[in-house]
């Protein structure tokens, strides 16, 4: 990112550049690799987001693959198509012309196939299940204690509305976030649960996407909250789509 | 006032290189999108890429990729745009142009004509 | 990519004429953050550079003559020309800067009978 004259920053997202060349000479902020203009104001898409990762200079990128164990985004990352609004396209190809649907968090839904595969809709991802595994500490953290403070973490950091974090749940060292969100509850200007994930997913990682902010600082009654492992399971509207040799596989 | 000087006409042979350069004055070079435009002879407009001076990020459209190298030079406030392999449907007038909503200012244009 | 496609192609009209120049997106311009539609309109006359008519779909740049006025949002726009004079012969472009790569419209050609 670069801070192109004084106070023309976005703050929400680095992966930006910013100029004085809005209309009116304002400040505009676009993200790297798709040049849309994005709200400063909120969370930048994950889509865009993905897209400015991959777009980066290779000696900067980090290629980060989750888990084994994990039950969806195993594909590592990919350079997504992202439509005007900076959502998610439902079909993704790559360069060999191999195609897959995805869902609103762009994880792969589908058996790959190849250009006459077709996407019908964006599935909407409503709920997330966010595993984390802590540090050993001397004893459990307070379960309203840990509850209340990443309740505020989401609210406060990711300007996600209370109402869409359905609960904290913890068997230490295992915390579980739940968030859910259905279509009909997403009112405009409203923060994705999706993208409220990814920047949760990249601040736990130590990646933080905001600019010049320190990196994510969790604490439950001053007792640091070090995360050792996460996964993330994603839940669609409509069940994803994939053949039984993969499922018995 | 903003204003974009490209360097003058060239005439190369196919397999050449060529390199247009375009010196920017009147504004902060570094903190604005520079983009290159080609036109045909009699032909439209096409977007090539673009680069922002102050930290050399640059985009390039897909179709000018390998033909195409953007660069800038903030010491002198002037970017430059490399056409390698020339052939003859390289020829054609190439414009660089300030982008952005208030994007009223470009270069007069550079012929470049390819001939044997 | 964004395909613009305008229409139409050519057109002669009479000096006090009203003109109008349609430009379709195949995908929406209309940035949902801001609500800024990324579409411009650019005049070309022989031997010049494009000159920048309109920004953000309607906003007219300033020295550009009242008689240019821009409209639509989404994938529609237009220009309009209210009283066309001897000085406006010349190559209309429409173009978006929403996502790269930027596109224009293929050019309307505007003459006088």
């Known amino acids: 990112h670069t801070a192109a004259q004084d106070n023309c920053t976005c703050p929400t997202n680095k992966m930006t550049v910013c100029s004085p060349d809005g209309p009116g000479g304002r400040c505009q902020c676009r993200a790297l690799g798709s040049g849309m203009a994005v709200d400063c104001s909120t969370l930048t898409s994950k889509c865009l987001l993905l897209k400015a990762r991959m777009s980066a200079p290779k000696n900067a990128r980090t290629l980060v693959r989750p888990s084994e164990h994990a039950l969806v985004d195993n594909d590592g990352l990919y350079d997504p198509d992202c439509d005007p609004e900076g959502r998610f396209k439902a079909r993704q190809c790559n360069q060999t012309s191999v195609c897959w649907c995805v869902n609103s968090v762009g994880v792969r839904r589908t058996d790959k196939g190849d250009l006459s595969l077709r996407c019908d809709e964006l599935v909407r991802t409503h709920h997330i299940l966010i595993d984390l595994r802590h540090r050993p500490t001397a004893g459990a953290f307070n379960h309203s204690d840990l509850d209340a403070e990443l309740r505020r973490l989401f609210r406060e950091r990711y300007r996600l509305h209370p109402k869409f974090v359905a609960a904290v749940h913890y068997e230490q060292p295992t915390i579980q976030i739940e968030l859910r969100q259905n279509t009909s509850q997403k009112a405009a200007g409203d923060v994705d649960i999706g993208d409220a994930a990814y920047y949760f997913e990249r601040d736990i990682k130590g990646e933080s996407l905001f600019q010049g902010r320190g990196g994510l600082d969790l604490r439950v009654r001053g007792e640091p909250l070090q995360v050792e492992r996460t996964l993330i399971y994603y839940l669609d509207e409509i069940p994803p789509k994939f053949s039984m040799k993969r499922l018995t596989a | 006032q903003v204003q974009l000087v490209q360097s003058g006409p060239e005439v190369k042979k196919p397999g050449a290189s060529v390199k247009v350069s375009c010196k920017a004055s009147g504004y902060t070079f570094t903190i604005y999108w520079l983009g290159w435009v080609r036109q045909a002879p009699g032909q439209g407009l096409e977007w090539m890429g673009n680069?922002?001076?102050?930290?050399?990020?640059?985009n390039y459209n897909e179709k000018f990729k390998g033909k195409v190298t953007i660069t800038a030079d903030t010491s002198t406030s002037t970017a430059y745009m490399e056409l390698s392999s020339l052939r003859s449907e390289d020829t054609a007038v190439y414009f660089c142009?300030?982008?952005?909503?208030?994007?009223?200012?470009w270069g007069q244009g550079t012929l470049v004509t390819v001939s044997s | 990519d964004i395909v613009m496609t305008q229409s139409p192609d050519s057109l002669a009209v009479s000096l006090g004429e009203r003109v109008t120049i349609n430009c379709k997106s195949s995908?929406?311009?209309?940035?949902?953050?801001?609500?800024?539609?990324?579409l411009a309109w650019y005049q070309q006359k022989p031997g010049q550079p494009p000159k920048l008519l309109i920004y953000?779909?309607?906003t007219r740049e300033s020295g550009v003559p009242d008689r240019f006025s821009g409209s639509g949002s989404g994938t529609d726009f237009t220009l309009t020309i209210s009283s066309v004079q001897a000085e406006d012969v010349a190559v209309y472009y429409c173009?978006?800067?929403?996502?790269?790569?930027?596109?224009f419209g293929q050019g309307t050609k505007l003459e006088i009978k």
């Open positions: 142009a300030r982008e952005g909503s208030n994007s009223g200012y």
């Open positions: 953000g779909a309607s």
């Open positions: 680069i922002f001076p102050g930290s050399a990020y640059i």
């Open positions: 995908q929406s311009l209309l940035n949902s953050g801001n609500q800024q539609n990324y």
């Open positions: 173009q978006s800067d929403h996502i790269y790569p930027y596109t």
